[in-house]
Interface confidence: medium
């Protein structure tokens, strides 16, 4: 029950996260005009990954798309790529995880297959979340660098007077949406990986155990799972696994391989 809940929650959290990553990628407010000491301006400028916009004091807003690949800063291209990779991985992860959900029965799909699919989708969500966080962070770093470079000469005082900070571009709403969404996708992915570990708990419980129960013939294979049973409570969950099924130790080792993605 806890495994199903963890898996389901991981799926929902990842779904929300990926929807957020898509929203952030499409949003225009990645960088906005910093109005800290320029609160009254006739035109408010802001930019996204795909277009640049301006809002006039009358409320009229117009945007123009970036009709090029070559003419844009390399960093912007890199951020676009990271966000798109994140969305694609996340979308594939969602598709895989739908079939992996324990609460959804698809034909005679075995628990081992569902465990594998859960792990795969979990890893995809983790990488997707990291891509989104990386993309947003690269863009934020670019803004911070530009902000401080532009204001580097703010202390060139004349007659002892210190100049005020210049108006620059600062973090837009899309950055915060992206960070939160990336984080949610990452958390969802971790939950899916945790759920994967609990999908087949019997694996270690019966490892290398062999005994006879009077009146019943029950066989347990070392390194494998219960092959058959006459016990009523278990019959509805009867699954057959081959002796080469992945051990819990192997399952455990998977997430650690992706710690440094």
């Amino acid at each position: 029950m806890a495994v199903t809940a963890c898996q389901g929650l991981g799926f929902v959290v990842s779904l929300i996260g990926i929807a957020g990553i898509i929203a952030a990628t499409c949003m225009d407010q990645w960088s906005t005009q910093d109005l800290y000491n320029n609160p009254v301006t006739a035109v408010f400028n802001y930019q996204g990954l795909w277009r640049s916009c301006v809002r006039e004091s009358s409320g009229f807003t117009e945007c123009r798309g970036y009709f090029t690949l070559l003419g844009l800063p390399a960093m912007l291209q890199a951020v676009r790529a990271l966000m798109i990779v994140g969305i694609v991985l996340g979308a594939i992860g969602l598709l895989v995880s739908i079939f992996a959900l324990k609460c959804i029965r698809i034909g005679s799909m075995e628990d081992s297959a569902k465990a594998n699919m859960t792990l795969t989708s979990g890893i995809m969500f983790i990488v997707s979340g990291l891509c989104a966080i990386a993309g947003v962070s690269v863009f934020a770093n670019m803004l911070v660098t530009n902000f401080w470079m532009s204001t580097a000469n703010m202390y060139t005082g004349m007659g002892g007077m210190v100049q005020t900070v210049q108006t620059r571009y600062t973090f837009g709403a899309a950055l915060f949406v992206g960070w939160v969404a990336g984080g949610l996708t990452l958390i969802g992915g971790v939950m899916m990986c945790i759920a994967c570990r609990g999908l087949a708990p019997e694996e270690t419980n019966y490892k290398a155990v062999s005994y006879h129960a009077s009146g019943h013939s029950v066989a347990y294979k070392p390194g494998g799972f219960k092959a058959s049973t006459g016990f009523g409570s278990n019959t509805k969950n009867k699954k057959i696994y081959d002796g080469g099924a992945r051990t819990e130790d192997e399952v455990q080792s998977y997430p650690s391989k992706h710690d440094y993605v």
Epitope: N38, T41, N45, V54, Y66
Partner: antibody
Framework: QVQLQQSGPELVKPGALVKISCKAS????????INWVKQRPGQGLEWIGW????????KYNEKFKGKATLTADKSSSTAYMQLSSLTSENSAVYFC?????????????WGQGTTVTVSS | QIVLTQSPAIMSASPGEKVTMTCSAS?????MHWYQQKPGTSPKRWIY???KLASGVPARFSGSGSGTSYSLTISSMEAEDAATYYC?????????FGGGTKLEIK
Amino acid sequence: QVQLQQSGPELVKPGALVKISCKASGYTFTSYDINWVKQRPGQGLEWIGWIYPGDGSTKYNEKFKGKATLTADKSSSTAYMQLSSLTSENSAVYFCARGGYRYDEAMDYWGQGTTVTVSS
Amino acid sequence: QIVLTQSPAIMSASPGEKVTMTCSASSSISYMHWYQQKPGTSPKRWIYDTSKLASGVPARFSGSGSGTSYSLTISSMEAEDAATYYCHQRSSYPYTFGGGTKLEIK
């Protein structure tokens, strides 16, 4: 390298119209706006408007609405400005200049200018 | 519209002298750009986004300011710096230019 090549000088009669061109090369024409700037002899600079070839959108200085019409031909990477109902006030050097992909960016490359003389 | 007032209109400086010209905006703006124009040529982008030097501009030039007050400074005047300098804002429609500061060499 980025270049903006403007058409040659024009001598026109009052009331007539003139169309001057600005051929862009060395960059993606559809990615940056083309601004038009007027400079009367011995005087300062005056912004007429911009056209964004990417989607054909335009923005005019109210003062030049009805006087100037901005167009762009993507296939030839050329921007045009047509001035109508010319008077002596319109005698000036007209520059085309490339803006940035951000609205408030400076104009980084300028054409050599086209001299328009309105005289009967 | 935002009116940009440049001062002084004309100034002269000796080689090696420090030069400062100002541009005052009638309303607060986000960036100021500066262009250099020599007689018979088209303007050149000189300083953009208030303080960034365009490529090829000597390091003796600098720009600063915020809100409504901006300035262009030459730390050590040279003969080739003699030109007219225009400030320009693109923060509000219509975009406007200052009247220009004509810098002459003594």
